[in-house]
Amino acid sequence: EGAAQPNNSLMLQTSKENHALASSSLCMDEKQITQNYSKVLAEVNTSWPVKMATNAVLCCPPIALRNLIIITWEIILRGQPSCTKAYKKETNETKETNCTDERITWVSRPDQNSDLQIRTVAITHDGYYRCIMVTPDGNFHRGYHLQVLVTPEVTLFQNRNRTAVCKAVAGKPAAHISWIPEGDCATKQEYWSNGTVTVKSTCHWEVHNVSTVTCHVSHLTGNKSLYIELLPVPGAKKSAKLY
């Protein structure tokens, strides 16, 4: 039932959060490296949702490093100048331009691994990341539209007669709130400067036999259900209807 809240809100969450830092990657393993990549995928763009506070690894096209001339990572983040990280194989030199975020780095030495990693993804890492590989056979691109996901904080409470409020605070993107059973509901969204959204759904149940109401919050990071028993109308010793 959850801990008793002062307002009798019963916090019941569908998922117990795992606080260990997770890592996500869209990389292919070496077996998938193909010589005829040029014929199949000269340029690939991927939309990639990544949970905030996880680690992310972004990969270049699956081109064998021995065929490489230059690798360039181009990083375009909102409100910042374009950052580039380049590696020139011939001289074994790396160069950075306008790159200030120390959490965005090569996974290891670029002559061994061309992948880019973001350690502890933050909202500010929303943006476009592109790897450009220059080879004797031409240029190959792989781009990522990285969408940072922020899990909303969910609360449920009763604020007046047979009216409950469910809030999904500071989620990215906006969460969707539904109720069991359906009530007379109004939903508002509040947009924050950091790109997160707070969704507030207020519902009233006129039907007197509704005992427990459930708020279901759907979000790309996972779903949560909370429920609460509706309190009696003040002054009512008995319900209007006996069952």
């Epitope: 008793a4 019963l10 069991i180 005992s211 429920y227 009696p232």
Partner: antibody, heavy 114, light 107 residues
Framework: QVQLVQSGAEVKKPGASVKVSCKAS????????MHWVRQAPGQGLEWMGN????????NYDEKFKSRVTMTTDTSTSTAYMELRSLRSDDTAVYYC???????WGQGTLVTVSS | DIQMTQSPSSLSASVGDRVTITCQAS??????LNWYQQKPGKAPKLLIY???NLEDGVPSRFSGSGSGTDFTLTISSLQPEDFATYYC?????????FGQGTKVEIK
């Protein structure tokens, strides 16, 4: 931790009344509904009604409403269920359950026999 | 009142078996559902709340699924201590209504 401790077994004659108690601890008694559920021997579970200790508001199942009264004593955090005009088919284990059904009392066996 | 139709009413199974119990609500209205385990002489014990959430301390071999009006309790690998009677309960509307129960017996 939340605990619901019920009164002991009772043997009653047909036509008599029984009052079962349920003493709550480990939470704010006045903030949660208390439900009463019964189970006849070898049968399923049957909801009887509930009471909100914060206001005394009650809901009774149609089947029991003429014979049951649910009350609370907030000073001792105790809920009571009184069933009148007992019949042999009222022989059952009576349970109290808090809120949304996570916590239950151990049950009270009420035997109605002549 | 919401009627809860639970099936099967009884089943025989062996240790290690996968067991599935279903519960369906009448009237086509969405409900919030709990699953309980009851052993002889004991009070019902909450296993699953809000259809698919495992109560603290309950082994992970128990799981709940479903939404709206159709729900399922699954025991992935039956253990000796799991032989008992299982009930579903809808708590959205008054009166609370229970399924008829499913007795899980040793084969």
């Amino acid at each position: 931790q939340v605990q619901l401790v019920q009164s002991g077994a009772e043997v009653k004659k047909p036509g008599a009344s029984v009052k079962v108690s349920c003493k709550a601890s480990g939470y704010t008694f006045t903030s949660y509904w208390m439900h009463w559920v019964r189970q006849a021997p070898g049968q399923g579970l049957e909801w009887m009604g509930n009471i909100y200790p914060g206001s005394g508001s009650t809901n009774y199942d149609e089947k029991f409403k003429s014979r049951v009264t649910m009350t609370t004593d907030t000073s001792t955090s105790t809920a009571y269920m009184e069933l009148r005009s007992l019949r042999s088919d009222d022989t059952a284990v009576y349970y109290c359950a808090r809120g949304t059904g996570a916590y239950w009392g151990q049950g009270t066996l009420v035997t109605v026999s002549s | 009142d919401i009627q809860m139709t639970q099936s099967p009413s009884s089943l025989s199974a062996s240790v290690g078996d996968r067991v599935t119990i279903t519960c369906q609500a009448s009237q086509g209205t969405s409900i919030n559902l709990n699953w309980y385990q009851q052993k002889p002489g004991k009070a019902p014990k909450l296993l699953i709340y809000s259809a698919n959430n495992l109560e603290d301390g309950v082994p992970s071999r128990f799981s709940g699924s479903g939404s709206g009006t159709d729900f399922t309790l699954t025991i992935s690998s039956l253990q000796p201590e799991d032989f008992a009677t299982y009930y579903c309960l809808q708590i959205t509307y008054l009166p609370w209504t229970f399924g008829q129960g499913t007795k899980v017996e040793i084969k």
